[in-house]
């Protein structure tokens, strides 16, 4: 028997089902009595999800995975996996025996959006050229870590004077909070583009500051 | 006729390192699993290693994991087990044994004795 | 210690029927299939009982296996004197990712 899972990660947002791969060729004559089927965390081997003498042993995994039990015969050993969680991410071995055996890894990437950049001044009044100025860029509830990336009006990178935190809420989502100290010119236009590097997903934010009232 | 049958083992000192052998016949070893189970003197079984049908996937037990390595010719129908950083608990007679996981380790070789000792 | 426990002897007169208990957890004797292996004195281990319950070709049918739970058992009925051997139960254990073998019980028939 030869277990065959998908070489690339299976990207899930957070909150959303998904679906790691696994298939076998089921030779001629095949009972599912004779099937041994494991999902386990391939770091740890704690028991996922198990098909084993002749039924489904059901979820050992918070209650959230569930197999394609009318596949099975096919060959079709794949898990689904609902609303996923932050702490879901990591490597999955499926091992399938009957009479002989095989295993593979397939590898579950988590991900969550960032949302729209909001954007603050310090001070946010009062402003003259040649003053500092202290812009905020903040970010909320995505995963992972994002890149953050400073721009002037222009589009030159502002890479000076940046500093970048980002903090883990108690979902594993990060708040990102990224600050531009920078002097002001007569007029300005600061950008703030907050990526997700996995699903490449850019949200921007700007602020643009004149002798009026200030614009975001 | 289903046989199996195991070669070289024999006494070596401890650290030393020696190489098992497993003949098959009588059955299409190339879609069979394997597995090494050893028998210490007055003791039960333990199982050693397990490996599938392509060598794709290996199985061992802690206590010779790191020190033992299992592997197969199918071309020469042949299961092997190198034996390094031998150890007096090693002692054993060491069985190769035909594994199916639905209808169990179903032929059994004749054993062949390991010693560890100076 | 084996993670798989079985008494280490059992006894009985010829005719009487004795039974092996083979006791595992969760991660092996309670959800996967349970073999039982006979090993004469001298001799290389049989199998006996596959898949919990079932017997290869040509092992008599005084042989039989059941499990409850995290609990496997091996009956003999009509014992004969040629039943003493060592018998041992065997489970694949998912936890471990490994073979597990009871520690074996010495069967003499008085």
């Known amino acids: 028997v030869e277990v065959q899972v998908s070489e690339d990660p299976v990207v899930a947002l957070v909150d959303t089902d998904a679906t790691l791969r696994c298939s076998f060729s089921p030779e001629p004559g095949f009972s599912l009595a004779q099937l041994n089927l494991i999902w386990q965390l391939t770091d740890t081997k704690q028991l996922v999800h198990s098909f084993t003498e002749g039924r489904d042993q059901g979820s050992a995994y918070s209650n959230r995975t569930a197999l394609f039990p009318d596949l099975l015969v096919q060959g079709n050993a794949s898990l689904r996996l609902q609303r996923v969680r932050v702490t879901d991410e990591g490597s999955y071995t499926c091992f399938v025996s009957i009479q002989d055996f095989d295993s593979a890894a397939v590898s579950l990437q988590v991900a969550a959006p960032y949302s729209k950049p909001s954007m603050t001044l310090e001070p946010n009044k009062d402003l003259r050229p040649g003053n500092m100025v202290t812009i905020t860029c903040s970010s909320y509830q995505g995963y992972p870590e994002a890149e953050v990336f400073w721009k002037d009006g222009q589009g030159v990178p502002l890479t000076g004077n940046v500093t970048t935190s980002q903090m883990a809420n108690e979902r594993g989502l990060f708040d990102v909070h990224s600050v531009l100290r920078v002097v002001l010119g007569a007029n300005g236009t600061y950008s703030c583009l907050v990526r997700n590097p996995v699903l490449q997903q850019d949200a921007h934010g700007s602020v643009t500051i004149t002798g009026q009232p200030l614009t975001f | 006729e289903v046989q199996l049958l195991e070669s070289g083992g024999g006494l070596v000192q401890p650290g030393g390192s020696l190489r098992l052998s497993c003949a098959a016949s009588?059955?299409?070893?190339?879609?069979?699993?394997m597995n090494w189970v050893r028998q210490a003197p007055g003791k039960g079984l333990e199982w050693v290693s397990a490996?599938?049908?392509?060598?794709?996937?290996?199985y061992y037990a802690d206590s010779v994991k790191g020190r033992f390595t299992v592997s197969r010719d199918n071309s020469k129908n042949t299961l092997y087990l190198q034996m390094n950083s031998l150890r007096a608990e090693d002692t054993a007679v060491y069985y190769c044994?035909?594994?199916?996981?639905?209808?169990?380790?179903?032929?059994w070789g004749e054993g062949t004795t390991v010693t560890v000792s100076s | 210690q084996s993670v798989v426990t079985q008494p280490p002897s059992a006894s009985g007169t010829p005719g009487q029927r004795v039974t092996v208990s083979c006791s595992g957890s969760?991660?092996?004797?309670?959800?996967?299939?349970v073999q039982w292996y006979q090993q004469l004195p001298g001799t290389a281990p049989k199998l006996l009982i596959y898949?919990?319950?079932r017997r290869p070709s040509g092992v008599p049918d005084r042989f039989s296996g059941s499990k409850s739970g995290t609990s496997a058992s091996l009956a003999i009925s009509g014992l004969q004197s040629e039943d003493e051997a060592d018998y041992y139960c065997?489970?694949?254990?998912?936890?471990?990712?490994?073979?597990?073998f009871g520690g074996g019980t010495k069967l003499t028939v008085l």
């Open positions: 969760s991660s092996n004797v309670g959800s996967k299939y």
């Open positions: 065997a489970s694949w254990d998912d936890s471990l990712n490994a073979w597990v």
């Open positions: 490996i599938n049908s392509g060598g794709t996937t290996i």
């Open positions: 044994v035909k594994l199916d996981f639905y209808y169990g380790m179903d032929v």
């Open positions: 898949a919990t319950d």
């Open positions: 009588g059955f299409t070893f190339s879609g069979s699993a």
